[in-house]
């Protein structure tokens, strides 16, 4: 099993939309996959794939979640907030036949706010 | 490119062990997404796959041989290897190497072969 | 374990003809969460190893001439040679990559009338 993930970095704007694809790979045919898809080590969702399809649709805020065979899963973000910023990794695992997991690198998403000022109000706030 | 060259003794008595090793060329067999094969061919008959390695060190046997067979890499030599204990003569045949990735469910790159013939 | 059984076992054509081998399974080579049929054609030439020709049941490896194709799902599959060339000589074997272990056909010998 091998898990490819993009793009490494993805800076986007407030408002708009954040696409992350999940490249999962395995050389024999898989009777159910769990994914997982987390956002600075805490878990968006764990949804598995049977019968070409996913258990779940949704996956954290503003987040959709879709199978394509063969093999790519994509996490979508619509709209994109600030709370969206971080890193974001995603994992998979077959569980039938039998237990083989990977995992992917690393996709640091930015998000730049709608109004520049506030990323400045932001930065330049300091507790106390 | 990828290339694939089997080496190892060509005779090997009956109740022995064959070793086999599968050198590497023009990839790195650390390389994530890749498994590592070995497939023998009886005399005049098909092909029998014998087993993998993966990137990861897992090993997947044909149940068949399970008990007898090792498969392992060795990463700073780019090479991996087939041990094949208790032989007898039934496991004289011509041993390939091959490789595939997890993206594609096949051979793709196979060694040119080594026969062993299990003889006292 | 899967068996993959071919036919003919021996195929005797005149060249420029066309060539068809048959390769069942004992069990569905379809996944229905990766859309793909597990099925892989290779062609092992006389005193060579065996080389790819078609995978996933119907895509033509690089290099490979287009006239060769495959076709089939589930449990039968086709390859096909439209026009025979001299140089298509050998052992044709159809491999399950389904799941392990990966098993082949005994192989179907093309040879030239």
């Known amino acids: 099993l091998s898990v490819q993930q993009g793009p490494n970095l993805l800076q986007v704007r407030q408002g708009s939309q954040a696409t992350l694809v999940c490249q999962v790979d395995q050389a024999t045919a898989w009777e159910r996959l769990r994914v997982k898809w987390t956002k600075d080590g805490a878990i968006l969702c764990q949804p598995y794939i049977t019968n070409g399809s996913l258990s779940l649709g949704v996956c954290g805020p503003q987040g959709r979640l879709s199978w394509q065979a063969p093999s790519h899963l994509t996490l979508q973000l619509d709209p994109v907030s600030l709370n969206h910023s971080g890193a974001y990794v995603c994992w998979a695992a077959v569980e039938i036949p039998e237990l083989e997991e990977a995992e992917g690198n690393i996709t640091r998403l930015f998000v730049d706010p709608d109004d520049p000022t506030q990323n400045r109000n932001r930065i330049a706030s300091f507790p106390g | 490119q990828v290339q694939l060259q089997e080496s190892g003794p060509g005779l090997v008595k009956p109740s022995q062990t064959l070793s086999l090793t599968c050198t590497v060329s023009g990839f790195s067999i650390s390389t994530s997404g890749y498994y590592w094969s070995w497939i023998r061919q009886h005399p005049g008959k098909g092909l029998e796959w014998i087993g993998y390695?993966?990137?990861?060190?897992?090993?997947y046997y044909n149940p068949s041989l399970k008990s007898r067979v090792t498969i392992s890499v060795d990463t700073s030599k780019n090479q991996f290897s087939l041990k094949l204990s208790s032989v007898t003569a039934a496991d004289t045949a011509v041993y390939y190497c091959?490789?595939?990735?997890?993206?594609?469910?096949?051979?793709?790159?196979w060694g040119q072969g080594t026969m062993v013939t299990v003889s006292s | 374990d899967i068996v993959m059984t071919q036919s003919p076992l021996s195929l005797p054509v005149t060249p420029g003809e066309p060539a068809s081998i048959s390769c069942r399974s004992s069990q569905s080579l379809f996944s229905s969460n990766t859309n793909r049929n597990y099925l892989n054609w290779y062609l092992q030439k006389p005193g060579q190893s065996p080389k790819l020709l078609i995978y996933h049941a119907s895509t033509r490896a690089s290099g490979v001439p287009d006239r060769f194709s495959g076709s089939g799902s589930g449990t039968d599959f086709t390859l096909k040679i439209s026009r025979v060339e001299a140089e298509d000589v050998g052992v044709y074997y159809c491999q399950h990559h389904y799941e392990t272990p990966l098993t082949f056909g005994d192989g179907t010998k093309l040879e030239i009338k």
């Open positions: 091959a490789t595939m990735a997890d993206r594609f469910a096949f051979f793709d790159v």
């Open positions: 390695i993966n990137y990861g060190g897992g090993t």
